[in-house]
């Protein structure tokens, strides 16, 4: 037993032209999550087949709102790591799919939606107990950077998880007939519980005497390769009890990869790269079905017409991609004219529009400055999808037919009187103020009291009324 | 202590077989996990791996070579044999033997103690 | 086959300086292995699975990487540190090793 623990570093544009767009925008803050997807063996990538190591989603990272012009930076990432406990052995091989999510956290109806934003797979070795590996993955145009690792839980150790370490009882030497657990030098291996001949690599054991085998082996004591064609005849005398050896020397000899996978040696196994549609550590699984149940979203699926395209989806209006894990993002588009707002509700779009302006896009202006004339030398001027006068000095309202009286908003202060001027106006102050609008009061000595100077800066600082 | 020695006939004629002997102390090759390799090196030029045993008796041989190459132990006398059949003058290079240990499934750990090297010409 | 190709071939550097050395893999591997040799004497395991040092290494060596990209740094290196460094990869059968990075000291 233990656990594989994915840390994320970043996820952001990848080097090279074509910065992607930022998923989030004032409009639409969001948020980003991650999945993982964990299976034995060296499979490739199939998005939606049985996570059978296991699976994990991580915590949703912090809102994000796109600066407006800026490029799309690397995005806020959640905190900690992810962690797929496995409660079997470690199998050394193993295959991951690692999805970045959005959750759009705008004016939604339903709550929030989600949408796939990348998606990244690899095959890797990978020994428990090992160091960090770090690792950088590109979908399109966005790079994700991230390391990973498999421990083991105590009291397991090994590559493989299987094999179990105690303290020593003694500090100097292990008991009789047990090594030291390297590299853990400090502890003994514990007794043998396995049932006796298991197979030390193929085989492992959670109960005293039981011996559970490891993918692609098979037979009591896990020393039998699994075969993935029948065998007729049996082939050797260390075959007889099986009939299914891998023929040869070598564990490449006849091809124990399946459907055109190519096979290469390893240390003590070997390993299969698979053609595409094909996965397992023989490339004995073919692509998805609809059984795996791969479309998102309500996607409806149905069988694929030939064994490259194992199923179809077919998406509900709104979402898109060769799993409807896409949401369109029709608004993108920006269908709405004259300044409306874009709302996608899915089933159909609709357009806010801004006052002045009507229509399913927004696209008529209901008040225009056509046939509107704005009397006494006024100009009409457009804005806002209303049109207003502005009108020549001395004359107001909406076409600028009323004569304007410039005091009727009584602009002179402290008691001051206003007088209608062919300029504007002009206020004869009451005694003891001044200014422009009677303002400033005057001090006895003569000194104007003027504003007070702004908090931090000194009185006499020359920008003290900028 | 870990030690391992590599003996061989010194100098062989072309097409002749040569036989080399890994002999080693410190570990048992009948102990899970433990394995012991064959690399060479020709003077003044960089390592190749030829050959390993397990403890198990699972072998691996270098693919450019496998025809010629056969790898063998004697799990009792801590000794390793590698024979290499049809020599020429290209096989001429220092043999070392090394331990191996891969404590689980299909990772090795390290090839961590290697004999001194027997040195081989082949000439005629 | 696994080609493992590492650079500089050749690299002189003073005491004290950091040297940096590569290992380019044609084909991802999971770990890397290095080892250094003296002249007249065999190699020593100097690094297992990536980045960590064997038995009585110094500490100013280090190792890193992932993939098809991995490297052996010395932080501050030493007369002792003259050697050649050969890196391998235990992935997949031929077993091979790079052709070596020979480390002078000026």
């Known amino acids: 037993a233990g656990v594989f623990e994915l840390q994320i570093h970043s996820f952001g544009p990848g080097p090279g032209p074509g910065a992607p767009r930022s998923p989030c925008s004032a409009r639409l803050p969001c948020r980003l999550f991650f999945r993982v997807c964990l299976k034995p063996g060296l499979s490739e990538e199939a998005a939606e087949s049985p996570c059978a190591l296991g699976a994990a989603l991580s915590a949703r990272g912090p809102v994000y709102t796109e600066q407006p012009g800026a490029p799309a930076p690397d995005l806020p990432l959640p905190d900690g790591l992810l962690q797929v406990p496995f409660r079997d052995a470690w199998p050394g091989t193993f295959s991951f799919i690692i999805e970045t999510w959005r959750e759009e956290l705008g004016d939604q109806i339903g709550g929030p939606a989600w949408s796939l934003l990348a998606r990244v797979a690899g095959r890797r070795r990978l020994a428990a107990g090992g160091p960090w590996a770090r690792d950088i993955q590109r979908a399109g145009a966005w790079e994700l950077r991230f390391s990973y690792r498999a421990r083991c839980e105590p009291p397991a150790v090994g590559t493989a998880c299987t094999r179990l370490c105690r303290p020593r009882s003694a500090p100097s030497r292990c008991g009789p007939g047990l090594r030291p657990c390297a590299p853990l030098e400090d502890e003994c291996e514990a007794p043998l519980v396995c049932r006796a001949g298991c197979s030390p690599e193929h085989g492992f054991c959670e109960q005293p005497g039981e011996c559970r085998c490891l993918e692609g082996w098979t037979g009591p004591l896990c020393t039998v390769p699994v075969s993935t064609s029948s065998c007729l005849s049996p082939r050797g005398p260390s075959s007889a009890t099986t009939g299914c050896l891998v023929p040869g020397p070598g564990p490449c000899d006849g091809n124990p990869c399946a459907n055109g996978g190519s096979c290469s040696e390893t240390p003590r196994s070997f390993e299969c790269t698979c053609p595409r549609g094909f996965y397992g550590l023989r490339c004995e699984v073919s692509g998805v079905t609809c059984a795996d149940g791969p479309c998102f979203n309500g996607g409806l699926c149905v069988g694929g017409a030939d064994p490259d395209s194992a199923y179809i989806c077919h998406c509900p209006p709104g979402f898109q991609g060769s799993n409807c894990e896409k949401r369109v993002d029709r608004c993108s588009l920006q269908p709405c004219r004259n300044g409306g707002l874009c709302l996608d509700l899915g089933h159909a779009l609709r357009c806010r529009c801004r006052a002045g302006f009507a229509g399913p896009r927004c696209e008529h202006d209901l008040d225009d400055c056509a046939g509107r004339a704005c009397a006494n030398g006024g100009t009409c001027v457009e804005g806002g999808g209303a049109h207003r006068c502005s009108c020549a000095l001395g004359f107001g309202g909406r076409d600028c037919r009323e004569r304007a009286d410039p005091c009727a908003a009584r602009p002179c202060a402290h008691g001051g009187r206003c007088y209608a001027h062919f300029s504007g106006l002009v206020c004869a102050c009451a005694p003891g103020y001044m200014g422009a609008r009677c303002e400033f009061p005057v001090h006895p000595d003569g000194a104007s009291a003027l504003p007070a100077a702004p908090p931090g800066l000194r009185p006499g600082d020359p920008q003290r009324y900028l | 202590q870990v030690t391992l020695k590599e003996s061989g006939p010194g100098i062989l004629q072309p097409s002749q077989t040569l036989s080399l002997t890994c002999s080693f102390s410190?570990?048992?090759?009948?102990?899970?996990?433990?394995?012991v390799g064959w690399i060479r090196q020709p003077s003044g030029k960089g390592l190749e791996w030829l050959a390993l045993i397990w403890w198990d008796d699972v072998k691996r041989y270098n693919p450019a070579l496998k025809s010629r190459l056969t790898i063998s132990k004697d799990a009792s006398s801590s000794q390793v044999f590698l024979k290499i059949a049809s020599v020429d003058t290209a096989d001429t290079a220092t043999y070392y033997c090394?331990?191996?240990?891969?404590?689980?499934?299909?990772?090795?750990?390290?090839?961590?103690?290697w004999g001194q090297g027997t040195s081989v010409s082949v000439s005629s | 086959q696994i080609v493992l190709t590492q650079s500089p071939a050749l690299m002189s550097a003073s005491p004290g300086e950091k040297v940096t050395m590569t290992c380019s893999v044609t084909s991802s591997v999971s770990y890397m292995y290095w080892y250094q040799q003296k002249p007249r004497s065999s190699p020593k395991p100097w690094i297992y699975l990536t980045s960590n040092l064997a038995s009585g290494v110094p500490a100013r060596f280090s190792g890193s990487g992932s993939g098809t990209s991995y490297s052996l740094t010395i932080s501050s290196v030493e007369a002792e540190d003259a050697a050649t460094y050969y890196c391998q990869q235990w992935r997949n059968n031929p077993f091979t090793f790079g052709s070596g990075t020979k480390v002078e000291i000026k």
């Open positions: 090394a331990r191996i240990a891969s404590y689980d499934y299909d990772v090795v750990y390290a090839m961590d103690y």
């Open positions: 410190g570990f048992s090759l009948s102990t899970s996990g433990m394995g």
